[in-house]
Amino acid sequence: APRGTQAEESPFVGNPGNITGARGLTGTLRCQLQVQGEPPEVHWLRDGQILELADSTQTQVPLGEDEQDDWIVVSQLRITSLQLSDTGQYQCLVFLGHQTFVSQPGYVGLEGLPYFLEEPEDRTVAANTPFNLSCQAQGPPEPVDLLWLQDAVPLATAPGHGPQRSLHVPGLNKTSSFSCEAHNAKGVTTSRTATITVLPQQPRNLHLVSRQPTELEVAWTPGLSGIYPLTHCTLQAVLSDDGMGIQAGEPDPPEEPLTSQASVPPHQLRLGSLHPHTPYHIRVACTSSQGPSSWTHWLPVETPEGVPLGPPENISATRNGSQAFVHWQEPRAPLQGTLLGYRLAYQGQDTPEVLMDIGLRQEVTLELQGDGSVSNLTVCVAAYTAAGDGPWSLPVPLEAWRPGQAQPVHQLVKEPSTPAFSWP
């Protein structure tokens, strides 16, 4: 750092004073010197380092009429809003000719009530769940002791015995306020008061109780909610989308979910209006007067297949001698699953019904036994899925084939040998 030489007497006639105060204080340090000839620029040092961006003003007053006469030079350094970084030893420095002169030092000190660097923040926590709060304060003067308060009651009786910068709370069962007090030799400062809101714990063990093609019954175990009873639980279901895929912890579904509210208890809900044979993801959250719990992870579930809701359409049945030609179209009503095939039944007056599994074909040629003279022959068709048969169509009478009518061309289906019968 620059040092004055002793070859000449110091030009300083006034040195910086001392300032000690609390944070935010505004103060001024002042240097005065008397020089002969052109007045020099006064620089300020803090702890031996030149302050490049000092808020200083310099006033120069001539003591005579000639430029070579003496001048009084006053430099004032303004400190606005005193901070810890402003503290230290201050000196003025001038260059006169080939010599450097520094004033006697003045000192700037910071001393006041504790100042918070960190204060506890508002937050929500699940009931009976551990969490931490932070508080940090500094002087000077040091030491600074911290006292934590919960609902305005001190949590310890002595510094060194209670928690300091971090408070570990093993769990709460009611919404509470926390603050910390910082004590030093100047007194006490109180932090902001943080409100810790106690929410219900996340529900557990979300599971299926029963499945129907268009509804699922689900149940769960509620988490603890402290002193606040649960008011309701909310269940969300969303169609699974393999393209996007709901991750176990993904906070939001890829599409608008189907939302249902359940009064509690019981912690059970029937979700209706679902699509059969469809994968869903479901999750649940429970709410008290303080707010909702976090959602459970998404649980993959699937509605089972149902039977087709309607019979095959546009059934036509014609007869040509000992052959009958039957064809139909897929049901217009929802299949509620994967179509596995069709069943066909035909029956004549006074004859037993014959049942056949046609598979996925939508037309069949029947080889009728006997001379085909049976009267009032009717045909019914039903579609089926893994869940079972859908409704049968209304009986369609077998009409005699007229020349010019189209005739299906495919493999003939002999009537089953068992049970065997023939029309007279």
Epitope: P154, H183, A185, K186, G187, V188
Partner: antibody
């Protein structure tokens, strides 16, 4: 149980130094708390004099700052008051106490009466 | 320094009565006021700190209230052992300062 006991001379001559000892039992003065001296003048007026913090730092009443010193001997679990240049105005009952944080004082000694007289 | 004015300086009451003692600070001391009981031959007893926090082991008939500059100590349903000297003290800033005291005597 925590106990504090003051000891020292009953009589001190003006311009001399007053020295008192506070012996603490049942608690280590380096563990926690601030350890104070308070005095009560005839007529019951109480004056806080200063403390020594468990860390060793001190804080004094500005009205006494030029005359007061509080020190400790951690091996004996004692802390001390020295008041220099006493006058008859320093005649009082002197108490040592422990403060709850930098709060109020939760344990006091019985007090020791000191008269400044020639 | 913060000046503390305590009133009344003398109070006579009967067992079973409720009494109040007041302290006024010369400037705001937030909530940081303590109350002590002094009895001959006994060590001073801390009753209340931070304006209204009851010190451990003190009966609930003692209560404190107030903040800023005006504070009150209330003793409800006086017991014979409550007749003593009472002092208030601010612990908001140093130097700590005390009220002049209130002597509570049996009527």
């Amino acid at each position: 149980d925590v106990q504090l006991q003051e000891s020292g001379p009953d009589l001190v001559k003006p311009s001399q130094s007053l020295s008192l000892t506070c012996t603490v039992t049942g608690y280590s003065i380096t563990s926690a708390y601030s350890w104070h001296w308070i005095r009560q003048f005839p007529g019951n007026k109480l004056e806080w004099m200063g403390y020594i913090h468990y860390s060793g730092s001190t804080n004094y009443n500005p009205s006494l700052k030029s005359r007061i010193s509080i020190t400790r001997d951690t091996s004996k679990n004692q802390f001390f008051l020295q008041l220099n240049s006493v006058t008859t105005e320093d005649t009082a009952t002197y108490y040592c106490a422990r403060s709850l944080w930098f709060y109020a004082m939760d344990y006091w000694g019985q007090g020791t009466s000191v008269t400044v007289s020639s | 320094d913060v000046q503390i004015t305590q009133s009344p300086s003398y109070l006579a009451a009967s067992p079973g009565e409720t009494i109040t003692i007041n302290c006024r600070a010369s400037k705001s001391i937030s909530k940081y006021l303590a109350w002590y009981q002094e009895k001959p031959g006994k060590t001073n007893k801390l009753l209340i700190y931070s304006g209204s926090t009851l010190q451990s082991g003190i009966p609930s008939r003692f209560s404190g209230s107030g903040s800023g500059t005006d504070f009150t100590l209330t003793i409800s349903s006086l017991e014979p052992e409550d007749f003593a000297m009472y002092y208030c003290q601010q612990h908001n800033e140093y130097p700590w300062t005390f009220g002049g005291g209130t002597k509570l005597e049996i009527k």
